[in-house]
């Protein structure tokens, strides 16, 4: 008789999840010499230990603490780039501007990027059929708690000028319910962070509006100012040109507004 299995509303664990995490860890430690001491088997064991045999709606930050310890890493606190709803461009940027870091440029962020995972209470099985959806099922699920934990710690580590890339094509350019709006904004440390600088990325070729005047950006400014952190905002009208100018800042066309 097949054992009854909880059906959740979200997609199941990414196929070949253990192999993917282990392979990513190995690749990361090969690319980043300062992390070559990391024991990827121990990293996988700690990752697995955070959710295996636990009810996937009852995961805590504490469950991920062993993994956090193994992911200890130097991140220049004044070179942090946050993003919301525009991950690909943020990653393209840090691939060019190698001294800046998104969360996914760290070992822990790299391991989990775009993956889904969950287990089942009292069994050592990984659930490949379905996992809890944040809205429809529960917020304390393995994936959501992981990203809340590492996002909070990443924001806490930031100092001086922190940059955030925002998607100007969205109806809510700043969304209070995003990870940036609900976690990172509130965990920037006012004693360490002087300024949050928002880069609003335009989508349309002919879009010349000043999206820094958008009501949601004004809302972000208000939240940040109340936390005694200065706020500044820049329009990036041409993201393609922006990236090109990061690659080749001496280009004569890069002196004009981008």
């Amino acid at each position: 008789v097949p054992r009854w299995r909880q059906q959740w509303s979200g997609p199941g664990t990414t196929k070949r999840f253990p192999e993917t995490v282990l392979a990513r860890c190995v690749k990361y430690t090969e690319i980043h010499p300062e992390m070559r001491h990391v024991d990827c088997q121990s990293v996988w064991d700690a990752f697995k230990g955070a959710f295996i045999s636990k009810h996937p709606c009852n995961i805590t930050e504490e469950d991920y603490q062993p993994l956090m310890k193994l992911g200890t890493q130097t991140v220049p606190c004044n070179k942090i780039l946050l993003w919301s709803r525009i991950k690909d461009l943020a990653h393209q940027f840090t691939q060019v501007q190698r001294d800046m870091f998104t969360l996914e440029d760290t070992l822990l962020g790299y391991l989990a990027d775009d993956l889904t995972w969950c287990g089942e209470f009292n069994t050592s099985k990984i659930n490949y059929q379905s996992c809890p959806d944040w809205r429809k099922d529960c917020s304390n699920n393995p994936v959501s708690v992981f990203w809340k934990t590492v996002s909070r710690r990443f924001a806490e580590a930031a100092c001086d000028v922190v940059h955030v890339m925002l998607n100007g094509s969205r109806s809510k350019i700043f969304d209070k319910n995003s990870t940036f709006g609900s976690v990172e904004v509130h965990n920037l440390q006012p004693e360490k962070v002087q300024t949050l600088e928002a880069w609003v990325i335009h989508g349309g070729r002919e879009d010349s509006r000043d999206l820094c005047q958008d009501p949601t950006i004004k809302e972000l400014e208000s939240i940040i100012s109340k936390r005694n952190i200065q706020f500044s905002c820049k329009n990036i009208y041409r993201p393609d040109k922006f990236l090109q100018c990061v690659k080749n800042p001496e280009d004569s066309s890069c002196t004009s507004e981008i």
């Epitope: 956090m68 310890k69 992911g71 200890t72 890493q73 130097t74 991140v75 220049p76 606190c77 004044n78 760290t106 822990l108 590492v150 710690r153 990443f154 806490e156 580590a157 100092c159 440390q189 004693e191 360490k192």
Partner: nanobody, 117 residues
């Protein structure tokens, strides 16, 4: 601006003890969790221990549990690490850093601990 100054390192024989200190400035010390991390020669950064802002909660790497004790004196804005039963593998530069990790940007020069017979 967060600034820290570590001291107390030195050469010690296996089984010996040292007490590291870290004087902090530029921020409200008691508001922040503080950590010790270390870097052995030719190795990466390893987290050692963390203490909460009030000093009420502490956490240790398995490799130092039972041998090292982290503490703080908020009135002196100073963090400490008492290291007992030192081993050769504890040889490293020790840094103190604000926060609980896993992401650290240590601001001090660190203090070198060498355990050798």
């Amino acid at each position: 601006e967060v600034q820290v100054l570590e001291s107390g390192g030195g050469l010690v024989q296996p089984g010996g003890s040292l007490r590291l200190s870290c004087e902090a400035s530029g921020f409200t010390f008691s508001n922040f969790a503080m950590s010790w991390v270390r870097q052995a020669p030719g190795k990466g950064l390893e987290w050692v221990s963390t203490i909460s802002g009030s000093g009420g909660t502490t956490d240790y790497a398995d490799s130092v549990k039972g041998r090292f004790t982290i503490s703080r004196d908020n009135s002196k804005k100073t963090l400490y690490l008492q290291m007992n039963s030192l081993r050769v593998e504890d040889t490293a530069v020790y840094y103190c850093a604000d926060g609980r990790g896993p992401f650290f940007d240590y601001r001090g020069q660190g203090t070198l601990v060498t355990v050798s017979s």
